[in-house]
């Protein structure tokens, strides 16, 4: 999915309000410095295209985080703010959200959510120049 | 059983304020959107606005702005529709309709309806 | 935005199939797959019979069929039956996050 014509402000808006309590709500316990940010990305579209992929592709070590509230959140965003998000996108995910049996928090999936902070961080100051 | 239930009939002055209530029950109520719609007597369906109980968002059809005003609380699964300033056009009846999960636009499941008659 | 235009009558004998268009611009039919088809008899509230275009949600008789070319939406009733008499409304997402621009409605009667 191309992510160029979505309403960045509007995702940003709702990312401060909600989605980023979630993260964190997620991380709780865990020290911000027990993780290395290893994914980056260059502006907007591409930061989407990263958390995309990180929140709702399963990895060795973390199965899905799709039924996890963030994970909820950022879709229904994506839905409203980029349009034909959902036409392209839902299908896949809900079946991921399907083949979940339970939610698991393990450590990869604790710094997968690590990355995903460090992205939407990155996603909330397009103007900084990449490190 | 899913369904949308609303508020009654209201009868109102010009220049005053309505608000109709929609009750949710049987589903998750925060995962969809709630629309609101309304239809003047013999006359088409027109969209006021929506509201997204998950992330918090409204949105308003562009001739209300201003005027109209979507709520949601969630502990009650409720949605709210409060228009102001009334006049004798905003004569309708007032429908919520639920939005589907993630595509917001299709509504499968509308209220009953609720008859808003504005008159001096 | 200025309302979908839809024609304000159809018709057609128990059997026979009626199609019903629905007609917009580039910002709402033509600039998205999000088109649907509610039906409405007198004093109660709209039906969902057509969503995505050319889905139907289940229970929806496979009478009901819709379709999309260019800016012009249809809904074909085929094999049309007394309980088909009622008001048909086309809807589309529009740009400006518009969820729900209608049409003015078509009366179909089943002659």
């Known amino acids: 999915y191309d992510f160029t014509n979505c309403d960045f402000e509007k995702i940003k808006a709702a990312y401060l309000s909600t989605i980023s309590k979630d993260l964190i709500t997620y991380m709780s316990g865990t020290k911000s410095t027990e993780f290395n940010n290893t994914v980056s990305c260059s502006n907007r579209p591409h930061c989407l295209t990263e958390i995309q992929s990180l929140t709702f592709n399963p990895t060795a070590g973390c199965a899905s985080l799709a039924k996890e509230m963030f994970a909820m959140k950022t879709k229904a965003a994506l839905a409203i703010w980029c349009p034909g998000y959902s036409e392209t996108q839902i299908n896949a995910t809900q079946a991921m959200k399907k083949a979940r049996k339970s939610k698991v928090t393990t450590n990869k999936c604790l710094e997968q959510v690590s990355q995903l902070q460090g992205l939407w961080r990155r996603f909330n100051r397009p103007l900084l120049k990449q490190q | 059983q899913v369904q949308l239930v609303q508020s009654g009939a209201e009868v109102k002055k010009p220049g005053s304020s309505v608000k109709v209530s929609c009750k949710a029950s049987?589903?998750?109520?925060?995962?969809?959107?709630i629309n609101w719609v309304r239809q003047a007597p013999g006359q088409g369906l027109e969209w006021l606005g929506v509201?997204?109980?998950?992330?918090?968002?409204?949105i308003y059809a562009e001739k209300f702005q201003g005027r109209v005003t979507i709520t949601a609380d969630t502990s009650t699964s409720t949605a709210y529709m409060e228009l102001s300033s009334l006049r004798s056009e905003d004569t309708a009846v007032y429908y919520c309709?639920?939005?589907?999960?993630?595509?917001?636009?299709?509504?499968?499941?509308w209220g009953q309806g609720t008859l808003v008659t504005v008159s001096s | 935005q200025s309302a979908l235009t839809q024609p304000p009558s159809a018709s057609g004998s128990p059997g026979q199939s009626v199609t019903i268009s629905c007609t917009g611009t580039?910002?709402?039919?033509?600039?998205?797959?999000?088109v649907s088809w509610y039906q409405q008899h007198p004093g109660k509230a709209p039906k969902l019979m057509i969503y995505?275009?050319?889905k139907r949600p289940s229970g929806v008789p496979d009478r009901f069929s819709g379709s999309k070319s260019g800016n012009t939406a249809s809904l074909t009733v085929s094999g049309l039956q007394a309980e088909d008499e009622a008001d048909y409304y086309c809807?589309?997402?529009?740009?400006?996050?518009?969820?729900?621009?209608f049409g003015g409605g078509t009366k179909l009667t089943v002659l």
């Open positions: 309709a639920r939005g589907q999960e993630y595509f917001y636009w299709y509504f499968d499941l």
């Open positions: 049987g589903f998750t109520f925060g995962s969809y959107g």
């Open positions: 509201i997204v109980p998950l992330v918090g968002v409204t």
């Open positions: 580039s910002s709402d039919i033509g600039g998205y797959d999000r």
């Open positions: 995505g275009v050319s």
């Open positions: 809807s589309s997402y529009a740009s400006g996050h518009t969820f729900g621009l």
